[in-house]
């Protein structure tokens, strides 16, 4: 056997090149046959009407043949006779790779609650061999359940991916990503989370700075409260008890003149949103005012607990208390 | 310059074999396939077959059974030999060379069959 | 045969005459045309999509076509198109031939 041929791996639209190669030659004609087995080039000259097919090199040793805008439907094994004795004949196979055609996701709902389960769907159509979905939030890589569908040699696949949220999730893209032979670099489509949570709510000490509550300070407490859709009421209430008259609330700020030892207790900021409601606790101890220096010592830590609950413990060494629990988130 | 020059037995009896033979002068004789075409008086032409330097054939098939051609390869020429004639052969019998299409041709054996 | 041809076509001198070909093998493959005078050898006239030592060919679907533009009283001859089978026995196909009278 002396005739050699290459198989072809060709992207659809692109070109395939087929060359048959003759070693030893002796001038035998050496034609080039398509699948049907009709004969695309007979030496130098090609019969075929199809205009796709055009010589790049006729010698003794070698046909060398371009098919230009390669289908799907030019895939299959091209034969090169040489007509020797005893007769030669040598297949190359083109393979043609189809790339997705389109890719689409779909969620099943646009605005999720947090701890909600949704559907997330990927589908890449009409790819030839099968496309490789993988799925990601933000950086990381997610397992999804991929089902494909095969028609006319083509295949359609569909990823589906289960996503609990959260509220970490909300703006956090999630992309569907393939993985093709025929498709160089990254090719992706992706939608941004958008995830709905209950306030979190956060009471921040404004003052006084160095937070000490004494019998004659003031006292002014901010309440941030961060939810989405942003929490649409605010409110100010002290736990077991009515708000001090002389309090003044003013928006998200809780404002207490002239502080004195009636005014001790829990004060709480609640914010609401359609999701659900949460609130923070502030509790109030108001010290004894100052008698003389030296000034006192104030040593603050913050313990941060799964729950997210904030713990503010101040101890005031001039004072003779005990340390007191001073915010509680919730 | 390309020339077939061809040869054979101008008369012949019904069961006889017709035997033609076509010589290549230049060019070159492995590179294509060589073929015999003939047409009865005031008729058409009809392929009868080809061959190949290496002795490879393709035959008409309503002539298949009765038509076997060879080579030789030494004198670059070809022959034609048809089996059991009728006066149905009879025809001028033609030589050429094949590129796919007949690109060159013998000037043609009348072959009469007559008892 | 499984080229058809018209068996006779005429022109009037320096017209244009168009010579037909059909067959299910030229959805395949094209045709070659020869022009025969009496007592002579054929000769190829057209080759390929429209290959040309004379005349002009073309080709759509099952038809080929050879057209002579200008007819001369030389161009008065039978006109054979053919083909070969698009199965793979590859057999050639000649149409019946089309006798052009310039007139």
């Known amino acids: 056997q002396n005739l050699f041929t290459k198989d072809v791996t060709v992207i659809e639209g692109e070109v395939a090149t087929i060359s048959c190669q003759v070693n030893k030659s002796d001038d035998s004609v050496i034609q080039l046959l398509n699948p049907n087995r009709q004969t695309i080039y007979f030496r130098d000259f090609r019969p075929l009407k199809d205009s796709r097919f055009q010589l790049l090199n006729f010698s003794s040793s070698e046909l060398k043949v371009s098919l230009t805008n390669v289908s799907i439907s030019d895939e299959g094994r091209y034969f090169c006779q040489l007509y020797t004795d005893p007769p030669q004949e040598s297949y190359t196979t083109i393979t043609v790779l189809v790339p997705p055609r389109n890719l689409m996701i779909d969620i099943q709902k646009d605005t999720a609650v947090e701890g909600e389960e949704i559907e997330v769907n990927c589908t890449a159509m009409a790819s030839k061999p099968a496309t490789t979905i993988r799925w990601f939030k933000g950086n990381t890589e997610l397992k999804g359940k991929s089902e494909v569908e095969e028609w006319s040699d083509m295949y359609t696949v569909t990823s589906q991916l289960m996503l609990k949220v959260h509220k970490e999730d909300d703006g956090v893209p999630v992309i569907c990503q393939v993985e093709h032979p025929a498709v160089t670099g990254n090719l992706q489509t992706q939608r941004y989370l958008e995830v709905q949570y209950k306030p979190q709510v956060h009471i921040q000490m404004t003052y006084p700075l160095q937070g000490l509550t004494r019998e004659g300070d003031a006292l002014e407490l901010t309440c941030e409260a961060i939810g989405k859709p942003q929490p649409v009421m605010v409110t100010w209430v002290r736990v077991d008890d009515e708000m001090p008259q002389h309090a003044v609330l003013s928006g998200p700020n809780l404002f207490i003149n002239n502080l004195n030892k009636t005014d001790n207790g829990t004060y709480r900021c609640e914010a609401s949103n359609i999701v659900g409601k949460a609130h923070s606790d502030y509790m109030l101890y108001v010290y004894d005012p100052p008698t003389t220096i030296p000034p006192p010592t104030t040593t603050t830590t913050t313990t941060t607990t799964t729950t997210t609950t904030i713990l503010t413990i101040i101890t005031d060494s001039r004072a003779g208390e005990e340390g007191s629990i001073r915010a509680v988130d919730h | 310059q390309v020339q077939l020059v061809q040869w054979g037995a101008g008369l012949l009896k019904p069961s006889e074999t017709l035997s033609l033979t076509c010589a290549v002068y230049?060019?070159?004789?492995?590179?294509?396939?060589w073929s015999w075409i003939r047409q009865p008086p005031g008729k058409g032409l009809e392929w009868i077959g080809e061959?190949?330097?290496?002795?490879?054939?393709n035959y008409n098939p309503s002539l298949k059974s009765r038509v076997t051609m060879s080579v030789d390869t030494s004198k670059n020429q070809f022959s034609l030999r048809l089996n059991s004639v009728t006066a149905a052969d009879t025809a001028v019998y033609y030589c050429?060379?094949?590129?796919?299409?007949?690109?060159?041709w013998g000037k043609g054996t009348l072959v009469t069959v007559s008892s | 045969p499984e080229l058809t041809q018209d068996p006779a076509v005429s022109v009037a001198l320096g017209q244009t005459v168009r010579i037909t070909c059909q067959g299910d093998s030229l959805r395949s493959y094209y045709a070659s045309w020869y022009q025969q005078k009496p007592g002579q050898a054929p000769v190829l006239v057209i080759y390929?999509?429209?290959?040309?030592p004379s005349g002009s060919g073309s080709s759509s679907g099952n038809t080929a076509s050879l057209t002579i533009t200008g007819a001369q009283a030389e161009d008065e001859a039978d006109y054979y198109c053919n083909s070969r089978d698009s199965s793979s026995t590859h057999r050639g196909v000649f149409g019946g031939g089309t006798k052009l009278t310039v007139l």
């Open positions: 230049g060019g070159s004789f492995s590179g294509h396939y």
């Open positions: 390929g999509k429209n290959n040309r």
């Open positions: 061959i190949n330097h290496s002795g490879s054939t």
């Open positions: 050429a060379r094949v590129s796919w299409y007949f690109d060159l």
